[in-house]
């Protein structure tokens, strides 16, 4: 069979997990962003299903803070500043890759993890279910 | 500060650019889970500021396919079903972590980017500037 | 070495439901980054990628034929599977698995094909 | 989907000439990454593709260096210096740049 050409200045890989474990650069591109959705933004606050943004802390995962959005109301704030409950704010949920150190207090190693996060708010029709 | 103790089991990171270069097992936790927005919710149909999802498909990424939220309109969907133009939709902004093959043909070498992604939209009021 | 080996029925009338299987060897889908593509070409005409699976179980289809496409796999067999329903004539065709690998380039491994009529 | 076109439909050659067969795509095939992801394939009587080319210039492993792959945007084309009796089948371009990926409808490479 054909081999694909291996770029000579690959890491070895002739570890026993291969190719399950990887080496990943962490000199990030574009990481100088900010990552504090209350500074980037304030449409948590003039949405019209406003969002609290949380801090999620975990020292033992990278990033090891992420902002969770957790719905103010359950309905929706209307022309006249009031919840309107015949709408619904509800959460837009992402699923984002994360690196958790695995073992723990390894410096140097972590296992890719995917979780589900809060990343703000929409207004929607409540789907009505009718009882016959 | 407190040191966190180093675990005896940790690979080894003699490594001339460690921390930069870390050891990450791809063995992905929760990875079965739905990564087609369409399929997981019907809110970006339902919502006062409804958005298209379009799919963002790099070959030489992980995640290869990223659906990127557009929303529909500038103004938000009233009651009647129409668009509002004294209120907006806006899209909701969220920094996510990829990998990126890098140098390429390398089967076990990455870089971790940090890319911004549109995950919805929301309605928000306008900021009105009043000319002097 | 990579090999890849489709299977199917060759024979189907109209209506009725392809159910392909492409075997190999060489490399794994439990491994990061593998993904296997399923690709045909009706008799003296070009070819048509039809579907795609990612180790991670992210399936992609052509959208011109997704209501009709299921693509599975099981990993622990390293066998990929393709179903079609409701087969007309126009699915008359070699059908090919391929190879892919997250990287710079689509599918580096074919199988032989298998060839599949549609006749009532 | 991106139409590619391919001309032409056959190319008689000469063994140890030089053949060249055009791709054209719909619409521009450069991704967003900035990579183009075109590729070319060659598929023998009888045969499966064999991947040629990627990324519009690139020769894939045990490719020979006859063979040369050019072009940007919408317009490519694959070259094959001094032609060999092994390089006679149908040669279809592919692009993966845009989703749903598709194919050429291919170019015949025949003797003269």
């Known amino acids: 069979g054909i081999t694909i050409p291996r770029n000579p200045g690959c890491p070895n890989s002739e570890d026993k997990n291969f190719p399950r474990t990887v080496m990943v650069n962490l000199n990030i591109h574009n990481r100088n962003t900010n990552t504090n959705p209350k500074r980037s933004s304030d449409y948590y606050n003039r949405s019209t299903s406003p969002w609290n943004l949380h801090r999620n802390e975990d020292p033992e995962r990278y990033p090891s803070v992420i902002w969770e959005a957790k719905c103010r109301h359950l309905g929706c704030i209307n022309a006249d500043g009031n919840v309107d409950y015949h709408m619904n704010s509800v959460p837009i949920q992402q699923e984002i890759l994360v690196l958790r150190r695995e073992p723990p207090h390894c410096p140097n190693s972590f296992r890719l993890e995917k979780i589900l996060v809060s990343v703000g708010c929409t207004c929607v029709t409540p789907i009505v279910h009718h009882v016959a | 500060g407190i040191t966190i103790p180093r675990n005896p089991g940790c690979p080894n990171s003699e490594d001339k650019n460690f921390p930069r270069t870390v050891m990450v097992n791809l063995n992905i936790h929760n990875r079965n889970t739905n990564t087609n927005p369409k399929r997981s919710s019907d809110y970006y149909n339902r919502s006062t500021s409804p958005w298209n999802l379009h799919r963002n498909e790099d070959p030489e990424r992980y995640p290869s396919v990223i659906w990127e939220a557009k929303c529909r309109h500038l103004g938000c969907i009233n009651a009647d079903g129409n668009v509002d133009y004294h209120m907006n939709s806006v899209p909701i902004q969220q920094e996510i972590l990829v990998l990126r093959r890098e140098p390429p043909h390398c089967p076990n070498s990455f870089r971790l980017e940090k890319i911004l992604v549109s995950v919805g939209c929301t309605c928000v009021t306008p900021i009105v500037h009043h000319v002097a | 070495q990579v090999t890849l080996k489709e299977s199917g029925p060759g024979i189907l009338q109209p209506s009725q439901t392809l159910s392909l299987t492409c075997s190999f060897s060489g490399f794994s889908l439990n491994t990061f980054g593998m993904g296997v593509d399923w690709i045909r070409q009706p008799s003296g005409k070009g070819l048509e990628w039809l579907a795609h699976?990612?180790?991670?179980?992210?399936?992609y289809y052509n959208p011109a034929l997704e209501s009709r496409l299921t693509i599975s796999k099981d990993a622990s067999k390293n066998q990929v599977f393709l179903k079609i329903a409701n087969v007309d004539t126009a699915d008359t065709a070699t059908y090919y698995c391929?190879?892919?690998?997250?990287?710079?380039?689509?599918?580096?491994?074919w199988g032989q094909g298998t060839t599949l009529t549609v006749s009532s | 989907g991106v139409l590619m076109t391919q001309t032409p439909l056959s190319l008689p050659v000469s063994l140890g000439d030089q053949a060249s067969i055009s791709c054209r795509s719909s619409q521009s095939i450069v991704h967003s990454n900035g990579n183009t992801y075109l590729e070319w394939y060659l598929q023998k009587p009888g045969q499966s593709p064999k991947l040629l080319i990627y990324k519009v210039s690139n020769r894939f492993s045990g490719v020979p260096d006859r063979f040369s792959g050019s072009g940007s945007g919408t317009d490519f084309t694959l070259k094959i210096n001094r032609v060999e009796a092994e390089d006679l089948g149908v040669y279809y371009c592919f692009q993966g740049s845009h989703f749903p990926y598709t194919f050429g409808g291919g170019t015949k490479l025949e003797i003269d």
């Open positions: 699976i990612w180790w991670d179980d992210d399936k």
């Open positions: 391929s190879r892919r690998e997250l990287g710079p380039y689509f599918f580096d491994y």
